[in-house]
């Protein structure tokens, strides 16, 4: 089955139209947007949910603003262009023929350009920074029980091998949750850090994108651990083009 | 065609080493996890560990505290279980196993290897 | 670590029968639960992932079901090659993934 058994639904993606339409009857979905197949048992790719998002009802909302070489997603949601698995297309264009670069999250990672603008590959995310301050609690969670919740969140809500999970810092209030995976380390199942990020970041924000599954009650030895901000920092293996205009 | 061929059979002496070899074929060896499951004789598979051949990265089960040690060779294509401090209950087919990343299913199997440990 | 616990521990069944394992998880593993087939003397051989998807050669016969912590694997209509034994495999949390005991199935 490529979802649910029963009720043919998508537990991991919610924005998809599902109907036993599959080989043998078996329930097959389809991304919203892109009319896309997904596989219901993994994430599916951030620029697949993206542009699912744009093709349904919407508030907009504006992300974070960006810090030195490392990118933040300031320019909010955009409708992508997705390649047949789903990825990024390396050059993404508006409406209005103004186009730019991206990274492998879907990050702009150059000046905005025209048509003739060229995108040579997909840079790939290999490190993702998620800045995280929780609410005040009682005391600060002990780092090491912190540390295995949030490893044991990722490779079961997000399906993310903890291997590819580099580090969890904590400095009370703050949790830093670093992510690092290159091309070669990934191997066949394993799930992309900028997928896993983008699902844990709408579910920090009351937007799970989870099918009938409640929302993310993250606990760390009984105490809830509630996010009151978060920030995401994402890293390339090849350095963004911005020019000295944009950086003063 | 994906094949799995491993090492022969090992009798050992209690407190010794063994080390078993897997060499992989018909498939990109560094493009899927490897485990290594073993079964003594009359019971039920036992998951050992597993690495990326790509980076080397391993996870263990902590039953082995430190006893299985798991490493691979890019150049062939190959990747060895090492267990050491073994003892009468260690005796066992060792197999390894091709894995995914995702459902944690196990779609390719070695022939096993049989390691007695006797004294 | 998750405990996987399998009944029955052996079955006698005829040719033609169906025959139903069930295979139960100490705690949830939402839908990452595998199904292997054993012959004496041979490695184990994947039937079924992720609960219902049937790998690639494995006769339609074959199939699975369930979420959560209670699954099953049945066998439509039991063919002589079937008889083996039966383990169920969990592959949702941290390492170590765990195996059930084992079913044995038995020519009745």
């Known amino acids: 089955h490529t979802a649910a058994q029963d009720n043919c639904t998508c537990p991991t993606n919610k924005m998809t139209v599902c109907s036993p339409d599959g080989p043998g009857g078996r329930c097959q979905c389809r991304a919203l947007g892109s009319g896309m197949a997904v596989d219901c048992s993994t994430l599916t790719s951030k620029c697949l949910l993206l542009k699912a998002r744009m093709s349904a009802p919407k508030n907009a909302r504006t992300l974070v603003r960006p810090s030195e070489h490392a990118l933040v997603d300031n320019d909010g949601l955009y409708d992508p262009d997705c390649d047949p698995e789903g990825r990024f297309k390396a050059r993404q264009c508006n409406q209005t023929s103004v186009c730019w670069c991206v990274n492998s999250v879907g990050v702009r990672r150059t000046d905005k350009g025209d048509l003739s603008l060229r995108c040579d590959e997909l840079v790939r995310t290999h490190h993702i920074l998620i800045d995280l301050r929780h609410r005040p609690t009682a005391g600060a969670f002990n780092h090491s029980d912190l540390d295995a919740e949030l490893r044991r969140l990722f490779r079961e809500r997000y399906r993310l091998h903890p291997k590819f999970v580099a580090a969890v810092h904590y400095e009370q209030p703050t949790i830093q949750i670093e992510l690092r995976q290159n091309t070669s380390q990934k191997a066949a199942g394993d799930v992309d850090i900028g997928d896993a990020a983008y699902y844990f970041e709408r579910d920090i924000k009351g937007e799970s994108l989870f099918q009938g599954r409640g929302g993310l009650d993250l606990r760390v030895r009984g105490e809830p651990l509630q996010v009151e901000r978060t920030l995401i920092y994402y890293l390339d293996e090849i350095p963004p083009k911005f020019s000295m205009k944009r950086l003063t | 065609q994906v094949q799995l061929v491993q090492s022969g059979a090992e009798v050992k002496k209690p407190g010794a080493s063994v080390k078993v070899s897997c060499k992989a074929s018909?498939?990109?060896?560094?493009?899927?996890?490897m485990h290594w499951v073993r079964q003594a004789p009359g019971q039920g598979l036992e998951w050992m560990g597993e690495?990326?051949?790509?980076?080397?990265?391993?996870s263990y089960n902590q039953k082995f505290k430190g006893r299985v040690t798991i490493t691979r060779d890019t150049s062939t294509s190959t990747a060895y279980m090492e267990l050491s401090s073994l003892r009468s209950e260690d005796t066992a087919v060792y197999y390894c196993?091709?894995?995914?990343?995702?459902?944690?299913?196990?779609?390719?199997w070695g022939q096993g290897t049989l390691v007695t440990v006797s004294s | 670590d998750i405990q996987m616990t399998q009944s029955p521990s052996s079955l006698s069944a005829s040719v033609g029968d169906r025959v139903t394992i069930t295979c139960r998880a100490s705690?949830?593993?939402?839908?990452?639960l595998n199904w292997y087939q054993q012959k004496p003397g041979k490695a184990p051989k994947l039937l079924i992932y992720?609960?219902?998807r049937l790998q690639s050669g494995v006769p339609s016969r074959f199939s699975g079901s369930g979420s959560g912590t209670d699954f099953t694997l049945t066998i439509s209509s039991l063919q002589p090659e079937d008889f083996a034994t039966y383990f169920c495999?969990?592959?949702?949390?941290?390492?170590?993934?765990?195996f059930g005991q084992g079913t044995k199935l038995e020519i009745k």
């Open positions: 018909g498939y990109t060896f560094t493009s899927y996890w």
């Open positions: 690495i990326t051949p790509s980076d080397g990265y391993t």
């Open positions: 992720y609960t219902s």
């Open positions: 196993a091709r894995g995914h990343g995702n459902y944690v299913s196990f779609d390719y």
């Open positions: 705690q949830d593993i939402s839908n990452y």
């Open positions: 495999q969990q592959g949702y949390t941290l390492p170590p993934y765990t």
